[in-house]
């Protein structure tokens, strides 16, 4: 038998440095968590005590706070290069900044492979890229080969900007030839590496015959066997295991995110390259395990750029503003309505008479809320806090949609609730209430706005053929997290201010800001 | 079992030829990329010169361009590198590499990734 010791990452958003335990900006030391400087203490520990060892990560290094807002991409490729991964499996946010944002700073700069068998490119691109990111890669471990093949999740147009050049396969579809080959040049070891979520890493066990072991990212899925070390509930133990349609037993695993955990995986083989067994659980990377000082070193190094981008205040919160995916992916959470306050006081135009305001409307994708900021920092909100909340660089904009527009937005906002998924609807100017009992499509049973034309606001039921104007991410007017609607059916669609600037200008202006959960949006069950 | 067997070096006086030869047994080399890798005692290890499986494109190092000319013959899964006009500064051991993987012959070459199979190496040296 053979043993081999898979290490894993995966979404770990440009946590580059320590992270409280929530995975927002480290305020006490002593108690935070993560950062390259520390994982790389517990790498080389593993690295010194055991023979063969694979440090993997599953995609989702790009986008998440100041640190990639500033480097785009560089500070991945130094900070990876130095922890000396072995490879990592493209993910959506790779393709935040555009292909371009992809080659130059990492695919260019990696002494690791970037692995994705499903992604194709075509047309002028196709040369440019040419062995720069790899279906698969052939690694020697000790005296043995591992296959890694890679999968990236086929909703990546939809959710960042890989361009026209690149297409999305399948990813069953793409990764069994790719494996056959392997199969074929007598590699019988094979790991799936790839960022499509925790349901897809089982159907790739299931299905993909010849996969050994599935490494997954994108759904920070936590898994674990035993009581669990911090606030994490596991979705299911460590590794999750999969019978195979073939009939083998195959071990799937993912680590969260935010590069909290680091995952720990042992894997023993039969000399025919078969699984005889696998064990472990995530490593909680907490202040036991010290920070590496040379790689803690070169940090501060990169820091010192970072730190004269956006440390000031902006303002203060008295109120823990939670940006959970746990909360704002399935519930009012009142970062969600902080954000909409801000976007419709940024478009405050008393032109008519008739109306206190052209706009009362917000809409925004749960997804594009980052991070929590806490409130125990003296209540210190700054720019930097902002861009890990508010990442990607986009802008809020105005767009004018009917009401059958909208209705169909707010019933993709639940169509699949429950799987943490982005398209989850943060509102602003809208009552909404839903029937998760009924079937998807006819979930909506109460959407009320608040009127424009009044003197005195209040909530009036959406009428269907009615055009109201709506302010939201460009994101959602491009039709991402699956809102096509409103990028096939919008009638007019003007570009408005940053993102950031705009939250920090009312922050500014509020100078004490104090959201609350205050029954925007609703659940109910049984007949209306 | 998986193996690279190369041979063909030797003593050769400078401006002399050899020519080194890369057997494979337990896997078919052309579906491989296949280099010629070079370590000088106390240098480290420098990729010569590669060529692919599929469209047989290659690569050479500057140091080798014009005077080494690397080929392959599926039928006898062997990969040759023919070394002309050889200086003193090509002394080392040289070793024949292959990667199943569908990497570029300078990614090959540079390495910039770990190259999986190894053969055991052949001595070449030239001196007066």
């Known amino acids: 038998a053979w043993e081999l010791t898979i290490l894993h990452t995966n979404d770990v958003h440009s946590r580059l440095e320590q992270t409280s335990e929530d995975s927002s900006k480290c305020v006490n030391a002593s108690r935070c968590m993560g950062g390259v400087a520390r994982l790389f203490t517990k790498v080389q520990q593993i690295r010194r005590a055991e023979p063969n060892v694979l440090l993997l990560d599953a995609g989702d290094q790009y986008q998440g706070t100041i640190w990639f807002t500033v480097y785009k991409g560089a500070e991945v490729a130094h900070f990876m290069n130095a922890l000396r991964y072995d490879a990592m499996a493209l993910g959506n946010h790779e393709f935040d900044n555009g292909v371009e944002g992809l080659i130059e700073p990492l695919l260019k700069e990696a002494k690791f492979p970037i692995l994705s068998a499903n992604i194709k490119a075509k047309g002028p691109l196709a040369s440019q890229i040419s062995g720069l990111y790899l279906p698969y890669k052939v690694l020697p471990v000790g005296d043995e080969v591992v296959g890694i093949v890679g999968y990236t999740s086929k909703e990546t147009p939809f959710l960042s900007n890989p361009g026209t050049n690149l297409v999305f396969e399948d990813e069953i579809t793409a990764l069994q030839p790719e494996v056959d080959k392997l199969k074929t040049l007598n590699v019988n070891k094979i790991i799936a590496l790839g960022h499509s979520g925790f349901e897809m890493d089982k159907l790739i066990a299931q299905k993909v015959r010849g996969v050994d072991v599935v490494v997954g990212g994108h759904s920070n899925t936590f898994l674990y066997t035993g009581n669990p070390p911090s606030k994490e509930v596991p979705a299911g133990k460590y590794p999750f295991i999969v019978t195979s349609d073939d009939g083998r037993k195959v071990p799937v695993v993912q680590a969260y995110a935010f590069g909290k955990y680091l995952g720990y995986l042992k894997i023993e083989f039969d000399e025919r390259g078969n699984v005889i067994s696998s064990h472990g659980n995530p490593i909680l990377l907490n202040s036991s395990i010290p920070e590496d000082p040379s790689i803690k070193a070169d940090i501060n190094k990169w820091r010192i750029k970072l730190d004269n981008y956006s440390t000031q205040e902006l303002g203060k919160t008295i109120v823990y503003l939670d940006g959970s995916s746990q909360s704002c992916r399935f519930r009012e959470c009142n970062m969600g309505n902080l954000i909409c306050d801000a976007m419709i006081n940024n478009n405050l135009r008393h032109t008519d008479e008739m109306f206190w305001n052209h706009v009362s409307m917000c809409i925004l994708n749960g997804g594009g809320i980052r991070s929590p900021i806490d409130e125990r920092n003296n209540g210190t909100i700054t720019w930097e806090n902002l861009a890990a909340v508010l990442p990607f660089g986009g802008t809020f904009d105005l767009v004018q949609l009917k009401g059958s527009t909208l209705k169909k937005a707010f019933e993709h906002s639940v169509h699949r609730y429950g799987q943490s998924t982005g398209e989850f609807l943060q509102v602003g100017g809208i009552h909404v209430v839903y029937d998760l009992s009924r079937k998807p499509g006819d979930r909506v049973v109460k959407l009320d706005v608040l009127c424009t034309k009044c003197r005195v606001p209040s909530y009036d039921p959406l009428k269907m053929d009615e055009v109201y104007k709506v302010i939201l991410p460009n994101f959602l007017a491009n039709g991402g997290d699956g809102f096509q609607m409103i990028k096939d059916e919008l009638l007019r669609h003007d570009s408005g201010d940053q993102d950031i600037n705009v939250v920090s200008t009312y922050i500014s202006k509020m100078k004490v800001i104090y959201p609350a959960v205050e029954g925007r949006i609703k659940f109910s069950t049984g007949s209306h | 079992q998986r193996q690279l067997v190369e041979s063909g070096g030797g003593l050769v006086q400078p401006g002399g030829s050899l020519r080194l030869s890369c057997a494979a047994s337990g896997f078919l080399l052309d579906y491989y990329v296949i280099g010629w890798f070079r370590q000088a005692p106390g240098k480290e290890r420098e990729g010569v010169s590669c060529?692919?499986?599929?469209?047989?494109?290659?690569y050479y190092a500057d140091s080798v361009k014009g005077r080494f000319t690397i080929s392959r013959d599926n039928a006898k899964n062997t990969v040759y590198l023919q070394m002309n006009s050889l200086k003193p500064e090509d002394t080392a051991v040289y070793f024949c590499a292959a990667d199943p993987s569908p990497v570029t012959v300078q990614a090959m070459c540079l390495p910039r990734f770990p190259v999986p199979y190894w053969g055991q190496g052949t001595q070449v040296t030239v001196s007066t």
């Open positions: 060529i692919s499986g599929s469209d047989r494109s290659t």
